[in-house]
C-alpha cells in the first residue's frame, strides 16, 4: 500500500504511476517545466525524497475526467 512519507524508486515508482494515472499516461518531468531535463522531476521528488498521492497525480499526462 502507498502511504505518506514513503519513497518510491525504480520499478515501484513506475508501477505506482501506472496505477495512479491509469490510461492517462504520465511524465517524469512536468511538461510545463522548461528546466534542464532532470534538474527536477518525479525521481527527485519521490525517490530522492518522499512524496504523496497528490504529488504523484501532478505527473499524470491529462487531468482525470470529472463525473
Amino acid at each position: 500500500a502507498y502511504g505518506p512519507g514513503e519513497t518510491l524508486c525504480g520499478g515501484e515508482l513506475v508501477d505506482t504511476l501506472q496505477f495512479v494515472c491509469s490510461d492517462r499516461g504520465f511524465y517524469f518531468s512536468r511538461p510545463s517545466s522548461r528546466a534542464n531535463r532532470r534538474s527536477r522531476g518525479i525521481v527527485e521528488e519521490c525517490c530522492f525524497r518522499s512524496c504523496d498521492l497528490a504529488l504523484l497525480e501532478t505527473y499524470c499526462a491529462t487531468p482525470a475526467k470529472s463525473e
Partner: antibody
Framework: QVQLVESGAEVKKPGASVKVSCKAS????????MHWVRQAPGQGLEWMGI????????SYAQKFQGRVTMTRDTSTSTVYMELSSLRSEDTAVYYC??????????????WGQGTLVTVSS | DIQMTQSPSSVSASVGDRVTITCRAS??????LVWYQQKPGKAPKLLIY???RLQSGVPSRFSGSGSGTLFTLIINNLQPEDFATYYC?????????FGGGTKVEIK
C-alpha cells in the same frame, strides 16, 4: 562513444577518507543519472547510491548514509564519490555506472574501469 | 531490503551447450530484473533489463524471462567468450540489490 574514466588506485589508513572521480565523455553529462557500485575482492556487487548530474541531488543506500558524499562538477563532466571513516571492509573496487533509464531504474549501460581502494594500517 | 539469490553458484559447460541460470527475489519485483556479465578484472556488462529486454549489441543467444520472484537467464549455443560470472539485480526499489553471482566455467 560513451566513456567513464575513473581516478587511480588509492591506499588509505583506517579512519581516513577517499575521494574517487569519474569523468564522463561522449554524451550529454546532465541527461543521465549516475550510480556508484562497489565490489570487494572476490565478492559480489553492492549499490552505494545515485546522483543526478543535472541538479546535483543524491540518494544513498542506508548502509552508507552519513559516510558517503556524491557530488558533481558540470564544467568538467565529472562525478565524485567520497567515503569517510574508512575501515578494512571498505577495501573494494569502486565503479561509477551510468543509468540508461530516464526513471533512474538502475539499468547500468556504461561503467567506469573501476578504482581499487585498499584500506590497510 | 530485497534479497536476490542465484543458483547455481557455478556451472561447468562446454562450447555449444545451453546454460540456464536462476535468480530468486525475496519478494515480488514484477519484471524489474537486470542481468549482467562480468569477466575477471573488468566492469560488469549489461545484458538484459526489465527481465527480458536485450540490451543493444548483446547477442541474441542470451535471453531472459520471468516475473514476480523467479527469473531465468538462458545462454544458447555457449561461446568461448561467454565464460564469465553472471549477476542478477533487482531494479524494483532502493537499495538496488544484486545476486551473489553464477560463474560459468569451461568443462
Amino acid at each position: 562513444q560513451v566513456q567513464l574514466v575513473e581516478s587511480g588506485a588509492e591506499v588509505k589508513k583506517p579512519g581516513a577518507s577517499v575521494k574517487v572521480s569519474c569523468k564522463a565523455s561522449g554524451y550529454t553529462f546532465t541527461s543521465y543519472y549516475m550510480h556508484w557500485v562497489r565490489q570487494a575482492p572476490g565478492q559480489g556487487l553492492e549499490w552505494m547510491g545515485i546522483i543526478n548530474p543535472s541538479g546535483g541531488s543524491t540518494s544513498y543506500a542506508q548502509k552508507f548514509q552519513g559516510r558517503v558524499t556524491m557530488t558533481r562538477d558540470t564544467s568538467t563532466s565529472t562525478v565524485y564519490m567520497e567515503l569517510s571513516s574508512l575501515r578494512s571492509e571498505d577495501t573494494a573496487v569502486y565503479y561509477c555506472a551510468r543509468d540508461r533509464s530516464i526513471a533512474a531504474m538502475g539499468w547500468f549501460d556504461h561503467w567506469g574501469q573501476g578504482t581499487l581502494v585498499t584500506v590497510s594500517s | 531490503d530485497i534479497q536476490m539469490t542465484q543458483s547455481p553458484s557455478s556451472v561447468s559447460a562446454s562450447v555449444g551447450d545451453r546454460v540456464t541460470i536462476t535468480c530468486r527475489a525475496s519478494q515480488g519485483i514484477s519484471s524489474w530484473l537486470v542481468w549482467y556479465q562480468q569477466k575477471p578484472g573488468k566492469a560488469p556488462k549489461l545484458l538484459i533489463y526489465a527481465a527480458s529486454r536485450l540490451q543493444s549489441g548483446v547477442p541474441s543467444r542470451f535471453s531472459g524471462s520471468g516475473s514476480g520472484t523467479l527469473f531465468t537467464l538462458i545462454i544458447n549455443n555457449l561461446q568461448p567468450e561467454d565464460f564469465a560470472t553472471y549477476y542478477c539485480q533487482q531494479s524494483n526499489s532502493v537499495p538496488l540489490t544484486f545476486g551473489g553471482g553464477t560463474k560459468v566455467e569451461i568443462k
